[in-house]
Interface confidence: medium
């Protein structure tokens, strides 16, 4: 797994697609729909908790129309998730083993209809703007989760949320190194797929402890980090620009070289 050294970890190749505008839908072009599992276990969110989880990560719970648009752009995910209308759905582009759940062999967004709010599932979130910049932070010894929090704060920033990383990815952030995020997860954004970076599709990769795509990394393990600085913040001394951003919309990538 990129940037992880000898540690055993498992990545999910989340194909995360940018959603173009759907006529009549209240969102801007370039938004991103993504599957979100904030904790270490699968299917753990009530409807209320699902809404809050998306908000906490800098996003909102996705609408059925947004998930449908993502599906039509190629998004698939073998995980049932809450949507804004309290339905539970998941998108399947190419039905196949080992995703047990689709009733037939045709592709589509599967729906379980409106579910009782106390049932628990994952959630699909939507993010369409990044009011600031996400930057990649590293140092020789890397960071524990707590050290990553402190490091970002010492550079006039916060540890980025998952939603902020997805938004930055949609604007061109590409880094083949996994980094800590605010929810304790470990992820990395890939715009240009390459063999060493976890798959042949663009997307945000998530590093899990277990091969069934559950489990958060040990907070004491050492990794890089992704920080977020709001628009009004001023860069701190000791930061260097890590290269010209590939993004058309100017997401800056900063590599912190200060040890």
């Amino acid at each position: 797994t990129p940037g992880l050294g000898p540690a055993t970890a498992f990545t999910s190749e989340d194909l995360v697609v940018q959603v173009t505008a759907v006529p009549g839908q209240p969102h801007l072009p370039g938004g991103v729909v993504f599957h979100y599992r904030p904790g270490p276990t699968r299917y753990s969110l009530t409807f209320e908790e699902a809404q809050q989880a998306c908000l906490r990560t800098g996003a909102v719970i996705a609408s059925p129309e947004q998930l449908q648009a993502a599906y039509e752009a190629g998004y698939e995910q073998c995980d049932a998730g809450w949507l804004r209308d309290q339905t539970v759905r998941y998108p399947i582009v190419s039905p196949r083993t080992p995703c047990v759940g689709d009733k037939d062999s045709s592709p589509g967004v599967r729906t379980y209809g409106v579910r009782p709010s106390t049932e628990t599932y994952d959630v699909y979130c939507f993010v369409d703007r990044l009011e600031g910049e996400v930057f990649f932070a590293t140092r020789l010894e890397q960071f524990t989760f707590q050290e990553a929090l402190e490091f970002c704060e010492s550079h006039n920033a916060t540890l980025a949320t998952t939603g902020q990383l997805y938004a930055a990815w949609s604007r061109g952030l590409d880094k083949c190194y996994a980094g800590w995020l605010a929810d304790g997860s470990l992820r990395y954004p890939i715009v240009t797929p390459r063999p060493a970076c976890g798959g042949d599709k663009p997307g945000v990769r998530t590093v899990y402890l277990y091969p069934n795509q559950t489990g958060l990394p040990d907070p004491l393990s050492r990794h890089h980090a992704f920080c977020f600085r709001g628009i009004s913040a001023v860069p701190s001394p000791g930061e260097e620009e890590g290269g010209t951003p590939t993004s058309p919309s100017g997401v800056e990538e900063w590599i912190v070289t200060q040890v």
Partner: nanobody, 124 residues
Framework: DVQLVESGGGLVQPGGSLRLSCAAS????????MGWFRQAPGKEREFVAA?????????YYADSVKGRFTISRDNSKNTVYLQMNSLRPEDTAVYYC????????????????WGQGTLVTVSS
């Protein structure tokens, strides 16, 4: 919670057949897949077959049993079956029935409920 009870295991000669049954009790959940896994001595538990619980449920098989095993279910009886034909010595294992909320992958750890297992021995 869902309780699962398997039956139908036993000793059979190579090339023979067996039919396993799994009865589910407890609340009826419309969002559960049912599956069969097996564990041979000294080996990890592995996926065998699965079926969605909805009408017209879709079936899934491990490559090693495709064409020989058939999974089916009778919703009116809350029962799932595994018809095993052309049995081989390497099919010897404890067979477990499992239930999971769907969609689910074929990883053992994604299945929520398990039966106690029934032993199938294929030997001459």
């Amino acid at each position: 919670d869902v309780q699962l009870v398997e039956s139908g295991g036993g000793l059979v000669q190579p090339g023979g057949s067996l039919r396993l049954s799994c009865a589910a009790s407890g609340p009826t959940f419309s969002r559960y897949a049912m599956g069969w896994f097996r564990q041979a001595p000294g080996k990890e538990r592995e996926f065998v077959a699965a079926i969605t619980w909805s009408s017209g449920g879709r079936t899934y098989y491990a490559d090693s049993v495709k064409g020989r095993f058939t999974i089916s279910r009778d919703n009116s009886k809350n029962t799932v079956y595994l018809q095993m034909n052309s049995l081989r010595p390497e099919d010897t294992a404890v067979y477990y029935c499992a239930a999971a909320r769907i969609p689910v992958r074929t990883y053992t750890s994604e299945w929520n409920y398990w039966g106690q297992g029934t032993l199938v021995t294929v030997s001459s």
